[in-house]
């Protein structure tokens, strides 16, 4: 089982220094600051799931040098910043979504010896991201359906 920690209070002070190794901001309808870094030098697991996030501001994650797991499940991401994708040792947990194509491509081109990238569908089942992108995000499909969620075709 993956480790877990209790959800923080909804009133998050982004100027505060967080000392914990795990931070849970799940389901708080947060808006991440674009010009400010989260101050959490010990955090190895950051849960941002279910916040309605459309993007992950790269500055917000800039100082999280120890971060290993970033959970952004249940967020309608439209893009993943290249600088974040290039962090080869970061385990990104995200919904199967065509917006992950850039993340997949950057990892493929910059990170050697990686375990297969995974994504999660609406039933919380894991899928190989490469396979999902190939089936659900082919050029014709992607332009027709945008970067929303897609069901995995079997």
């Amino acid at each position: 089982l993956e480790p877990s920690c209790t959800v923080s209070s909804a009133d998050v002070d982004w100027n505060a220094e967080f000392s914990a190794t795990c931070l849970n901001f799940s389901g708080l309808s947060l808006s991440l600051p674009h010009n400010q870094s989260l101050r959490a030098s010990n955090v190895i697991l950051l849960d941002l799931s279910g916040n309605g996030l459309r993007e992950l501001p790269v500055t917000f994650f800039a100082h999280l040098q120890k971060l290993e797991v970033l959970n952004v499940l249940r967020n309608p991401l439209s893009r993943v910043d290249g600088a974040l994708a290039a962090r080869c040792d970061l385990d990104l947990q995200a919904d199967c979504n065509c917006a992950l194509e850039s993340w997949h491509d950057i990892r493929r081109d910059n990170c050697s010896g990686q375990k297969p990238l995974l994504c999660w569908d609406t039933t919380s089942s894991q899928h190989n991201l490469s396979a999902f992108l190939e089936v659900s995000c082919a050029p014709g499909l992607a332009s027709a359906t945008g970067s929303g969620h897609h069901h995995h075709h079997h």
Epitope: E2, P3, T6, K66
Partner: antibody
Framework: QVTLKESGPGTVQPSQTLSLTCSFS??????????VSWIRQSSGKGLEWLAH???????RYNPSLKSRLTISKDTSSNQVFLRITSVDTADTATYYC?????????????????WGAGTTVTVSS | DVVMTQTPKSMSMSVGERVTLNCKAS??????VSWYQQKPEQSPKLLIY???NRYTGVPDRFTGSGSATDFTLTISSMQAEDLADYHC?????????FGAGTKLELK
């Protein structure tokens, strides 16, 4: 096979500096997420975490001892060091080094998976 | 600092009995708790991490449970080789802290 082995002076005089070495094999301290901690145990007592050094040379210390502790590493020779200044009899203990691994198949955990056998240090004049 | 309180300090059990060891954190530590077994004159060995994950090679008679502040290590059927000190430790916040240990003895 991952192994760690502590070495130290055995006996050190009060007010002197204690220098400990942890020699390890089977992993690299340049691997992302990897780290080594020093933990001690006084006779018949519980475990006390002292300091941790990360793969990127970042360090964490127990605040109760921070002013007296220095942790460092030599990645190329697979060694981690701990210095404790101004020792007194309360520093008499068995000193362990232990590895915090990076688990790439279920990350986000923090635990010590392998410990050294320990080195006994007596502070006495 | 997070204080980890282990109970009981010691317990005498017979082979085959079910053993329950408790560990209470002074504040919420999620599931960032590990259990270590330490036999006489040996170093600690990892049994359980993440409160409930059995470490590789650890017999399945050892089970960890709990979250937040209350944690339990259970030995379903005690064996003679289980006589040892058992330590819980939290890694949710620095400084990392351990309980004082529970000594498991033979009745």
């Amino acid at each position: 096979q991952v192994t760690l082995k502590e070495s130290g002076p055995g006996t050190v005089q009060p007010s002197q500096t204690l220098s400990l070495t942890c020699s390890f094999s089977g992993f690299s301290l340049s691997t992302s997420g990897m780290g080594v901690s020093w933990i001690r145990q006084s006779s018949g007592k519980g475990l006390e975490w002292l300091a941790h050094i990360y793969w990127d040379d970042d360090k964490r210390y127990n605040p109760s001892l921070k002013s007296r502790l220095t942790i460092s590493k030599d990645t190329s020779s697979n060694q981690v060091f701990l210095r404790i200044t101004s020792v007194d009899t309360a520093d008499t203990a068995t000193y362990y080094c232990a590895r915090r691994p990076r688990d790439f198949y279920g990350g986000g955990h923090w635990y010590f998976d392998v410990w050294g056998a320990g080195t006994t240090v007596t502070v006495s004049s | 600092d997070v204080v980890m309180t282990q109970t009981p300090k010691s317990m005498s059990m017979s082979v085959g009995e079910r053993v329950t060891l408790n560990c209470k954190a002074s504040e919420n530590v999620g599931t960032y708790v590990s259990w270590y077994q330490q036999k006489p004159e040996q170093s600690p060995k990892l049994l359980i991490y993440g409160a409930s994950n059995r470490y590789t090679g650890v017999p399945d008679r050892f089970t960890g449970s709990g979250s937040a502040t209350d944690f339990t290590l259970t030995i379903s059927s005690m064996q003679a080789e289980d006589l040892a000190d058992y330590h819980c430790g939290q890694s949710y916040n620095f400084p990392l802290t351990f309980g004082a240990g529970t000594k498991l003895e033979l009745k």
